[in-house]
Interface confidence: low
Amino acid sequence: QDEDFKASDDLTSISPEKRFKVSISGTEVVVTCPDVFGYDNIKWEKNDNLVEGASNRELSQKEFSEVDDSGYYACYADSIKEKSYLYLRARVCANCIEVNL
Amino acid sequence: FKVSVEELEDRVFLSCNTSVLRIEGTMGIQLPHSRTLDLGKRILDPRGIYRCNATEEQSDKAPYMQVYYRMCQNCVELNSAT
């Protein structure tokens, strides 16, 4: 039953620059805004609230909390009104690695 | 026209005021007589890109929603001896 739900590795139907990149290492989570906005001044929102002090394509959280920091993320450029949206839920741990079974 | 993500017990559901379009990623199952897509158990790390179904003239109001779960089911804790 659950085989139906496995994530597809064949993500070909949208160009890569339109995707968020999520990198997780230990307790650090880095979310990279899609490239569609170029390198303009980027604004980030989390659950519809502006993330103060975040203006790069990368939003980094050194001590990500699954409870507090999971949710809706949006990024957009000052010059473009269109937003890109990400729903992220991540469980992190300081001294662990993810093994591919 | 924004996709909303809901968790009910251990499953992940996407819903729209119209229906949910899968652009790529986890297939999910469209619930009958509903505007909801069941992405399955969250421990299977559903991931993909989705948007609400909209008419041609409204499509710019239906942004993409990327979904990314990482529930660490295959995480191995390292101790100092490892």
């Epitope: 609230n49 001590e63 909390s65 699954e66 409870v67 507090d68 920091d69 999971s70 839920r89 469980r91 741990c93 662990c96 | 809901e6 968790e7 009910l8 017990e9 251990d10 499953r11 158990k41 969250r42 421990i43 529930m71 660490c72 089911q73 995480c75 804790e77």
Partner: antibody
Framework: ELTLQESGPGLVKPSQTLSLTCVVS?????????WNWIRQRPGRGLEWMGY?????IYNPTFQGRISITADTAKSQFSLQLRSMTTEDTAMYFC?????????????WGQGTLVTVSS | SYVLTQLPSKNVTLKQPAHITCGGD??????VHWYQQKLGQAPVMIIY???SRPTGIPERFSGANSGNTATLTISGALAEDEADYYC???????????FGGGTHLTVL
């Protein structure tokens, strides 16, 4: 319907180790959820102690003398609290987050009263 | 670590609205959950994520959260609402769940 049931000794001597177990029915103990221990001293408020979710996180108040483990095959998780003092006399609850309420405690056991006395 | 402040007790007249507050530094940026605990019973979650109500919780219970204060409102308090009420958040810096000290509501 998910139910949680605590069990353990009602009386513990000072300096001993408290061992409590929470048996889960109507569901299984898996790493998908946070499985918590919370206590309430007489006439006081609620105090979160820690959780198990494959790995563990503990309230710094108890760091060094607390251990939470799980036996997924038996669908139960346990609390060990070492070096008990009379200040540890409390009602001990096990609890789990809700599917839609991450970080909140949607399911609770009825609690088990632990008295520390010689 | 993060501190949540609640008034120890509050009185409300039967069928009148009751407002129970929970103070914390920039609490508006956190998810606040509320619990009701009746004498000799386990707590029951009555509000989660600031204002969401679990199935089976009466509509008279509602929640709001902004700035430095979260508020639980009972639109018309009934005798059965006499209980202790606790707010709770997750303190991500301390990696710990934090409860307020609780407010005992008496319905007169």
């Amino acid at each position: 319907e998910l139910t949680l049931q605590e069990s353990g000794p009602g009386l513990v001597k000072p300096s001993q180790t408290l061992s409590l177990t929470c048996v889960v029915s109507g569901g299984s103990v898996t790493r998908s959820y946070y499985w918590n221990w919370i206590r309430q001293r007489p006439g006081r408020g609620l105090e979160w102690m820690g959780y198990w979710t494959g790995s563990t996180i503990y309230n710094p108040t108890f760091q060094g003398r607390i251990s939470i483990t799980a036996d997924t095959a038996k669908s139960q998780f346990s609390l060990q609290l070492r070096s008990m003092t009379t200040e540890d006399t409390a009602m001990y609850f096990c609890a789990r987050e809700g599917g839609k309420s991450l970080g909140a405690f949607a399911y609770w056991g009825q609690g088990t009263l632990v008295t520390v006395s010689s | 670590s993060y501190v949540l402040t609640q008034l120890p007790s509050k009185n409300v007249t039967l069928k009148q609205p009751a407002h129970i507050t929970c103070g914390g530094d920039k609490i508006g940026s956190k998810n606040v959950h509320w619990y009701q605990q009746k004498l000799g019973q386990a707590p029951v979650m009555i509000i989660y994520y600031d204002s969401s109500r679990p199935t089976g919780i009466p509509e008279r219970f509602s929640g709001a959260n902004s700035g430095n204060t979260a508020t639980l409102t009972i639109s018309g308090a009934l005798a059965e609402d006499e209980a202790d009420y606790y707010c709770q958040v997750w303190d991500s810096s301390a990696k710990a769940a934090v409860f307020g000290g609780g407010t005992h509501l008496t319905v007169l």
